[in-house]
Interface confidence: low
Amino acid sequence: KIDACKRGDVTVKPSHVILLGSTVNITCSLKPRQGCFHYSRRNKLILYKFDRRINFHHGHSLNSQVTGLPLGTTLFVCKLACINSDEIQICGAEIFVGVAPEQPQNLSCIQKGEQGTVACTWERGRDTHLYTEYTLQLSGPKNLTWQKQCKDIYCDYLDFGINLTPESPESNFTAKVTAVNSLGSSSSLPSTFTFLDIVRPLPPWDIRIKFQKASVSRCTLYWRDEGLVLLNRLRYRPSNSRLWNMVNVTKAKGRHDLLDLKPFTEYEFQISSKLHLYKGSWSDWSESLRAQTPEEEPTGMLDVWYMKRHIDYSRQQISLFWKNLSVSEARGKILHYQVTLQELTGGKAMTQNITGHTSWTTVIPRTGNWAVAVSAANSKGSSLPTRINIMNLCEAGLLAPRQVSANSEGMDNILVTWQPPRKDPSAVQEYVVEWRELHPGGDTQVPLNWLRSRPYNVSALISENIKSYICYEIRVYALSGDQGGCSSILGNSKHKAPLSGPHINAITEEKGSILISWNSIPVQEQMGCLLHYRIYWKERDSNSQPQLCEIPYRVSQNSHPINSLQPRVTYVLWMTALTAAGESSHGNEREFCLQGKAN
């Protein structure tokens, strides 16, 4: 009831709690002398379902049959309406619509750890929408019985608060859960189990790792477990990996040797436990242990490349470059690189340790046969040295790769293609594709990049250290024994018109023609590989179209003659530069008047 109902009553038949789909009869009746003053025939009783009128009747009582009520609670209110007054609330009733409980399914019980307590879970089935009581019963040997109840509408878990002990690990226990509400009851199938079936060990703790003689090949993992544990499973992975290595061990007694760890790698280790070979469940995984394995001496060999530069008639500069070993090859922190330079005929050798760099430059005589060896060292030893005979990499013209091209391939990639050299292509042992940012000054400090390609390949995709709007000088070397041939090309991954034109710095007269000199456009304003320069000129104060001369771009060229100017005429000259994407804006303007005689 929702109030004291002084004026009348609302009765519900057959019950306030009904099965979904049932019909209910609702009666509203006034108590004596509670109708409208004077005119009892004018009593108008109105039945509301929540706030909506569903029926009315003149008189002392109202009957209404209601069907199709939804699951859950529906509120009915009866009101009296008299002439010239507001409706008065008489009485009300709540009707609860639900279903009988379904049979609880998948009853399972567990005891966490040997000292834990037994707790069971089950699936309730569909919601009854009614107050439902669950009773969990556990019966064991010697007619022992435990019972626990919960009256929560969403109950699907109960803890008995009792501890099963391993005195008789094979003794049977039976659990059953019963659900009861106003519309019916249902019990689960019984679940029968032993101590070994339901005890789930606590996860191992106090995990440690030891490396005998600081060697990764002699590694033992230690941990502590509950007393009855028979089985363990270990999982471990490098910290930067998502995939676990898994090992199952029996009767490990808190220790296991690991044989396949990689050196100088941070690993994550976890352990889980179980009491019986085929009964019971695995514990949760332990907390992670993180540990770094010791170093081992490097494996693999460095990828070494070099550049020669002529200094004068007797000396040459050798620049050596090498790539870092991969983590799996370095097997530790590389402390230094050892470079040995040797003159092969005279036997003179020079060794140097390089720290913090992957390049080395030295000056050697142009005479003699020179070789270098480079190795990487960590705290445990050195890699095998990479040996290279220094030769003129571009000397063999017949070994030069043909038709070298460089084309943009997506973002910050350049596809380099070539044709094998004219000389017997089968003589090629490997190709090396080398690239570096193009700097007009031929700056030797510009980083060098390279990759090696098998002799049957005629293309390579270069992506390392490739930036948009930068021009790269690309060389393809074909190597055969102690000979090499090379071809070069300029290429960029992305280009647009240069941001500025060349700056004319001087115009000089030479035998009736002029020589224009200019400063290179700064690299960051070239916006790719320059293809051409244009020199424009027109008579000062003239409205005529300018004339122009277009010259192919050469890295080292910074001047050009023009011989079509008339003497004693003042001209205005300026320059632009072009990439494949278009022409730059004008550079500075210079005026010039040719003093010489007319042709």
Partner: nanobody, 127 residues
Amino acid sequence: QVQLQESGGGLVQAGGSLRLSCAASGRTVDSYAMGWFRQTPGKEREFVAASWGGGSTYYADSVKGRFTISRDNVKNTMYLQMDSLKPEDTAVYYCAAGPTYYSGPINDNWEGRYDSWGQGTQVTVSS
């Protein structure tokens, strides 16, 4: 000098497409300026499109947005893709080439800009 040979002309209906080719021999033309001109009987030769060695392209106003000039420097060939053809595009089409380094007016329709010419190929657009 460079020898030039046009091909790809023919009869096509208005709204159709043709692709003209100009094959160069004698030397590589990757740094040359190359152009297309056309001529109808009794009229002067008319500039159509040009491709300079630096990669710049230029078009006559009458063909902008319909014609595309391109070149394949490996094959030493220049192309003119002609789409949405109109009856007034009917003409003999000539291919021309000239060294990019030259002294002369900047406007590309100046015929003196080019010193090598092909024999021409007939394009007829019927309505």
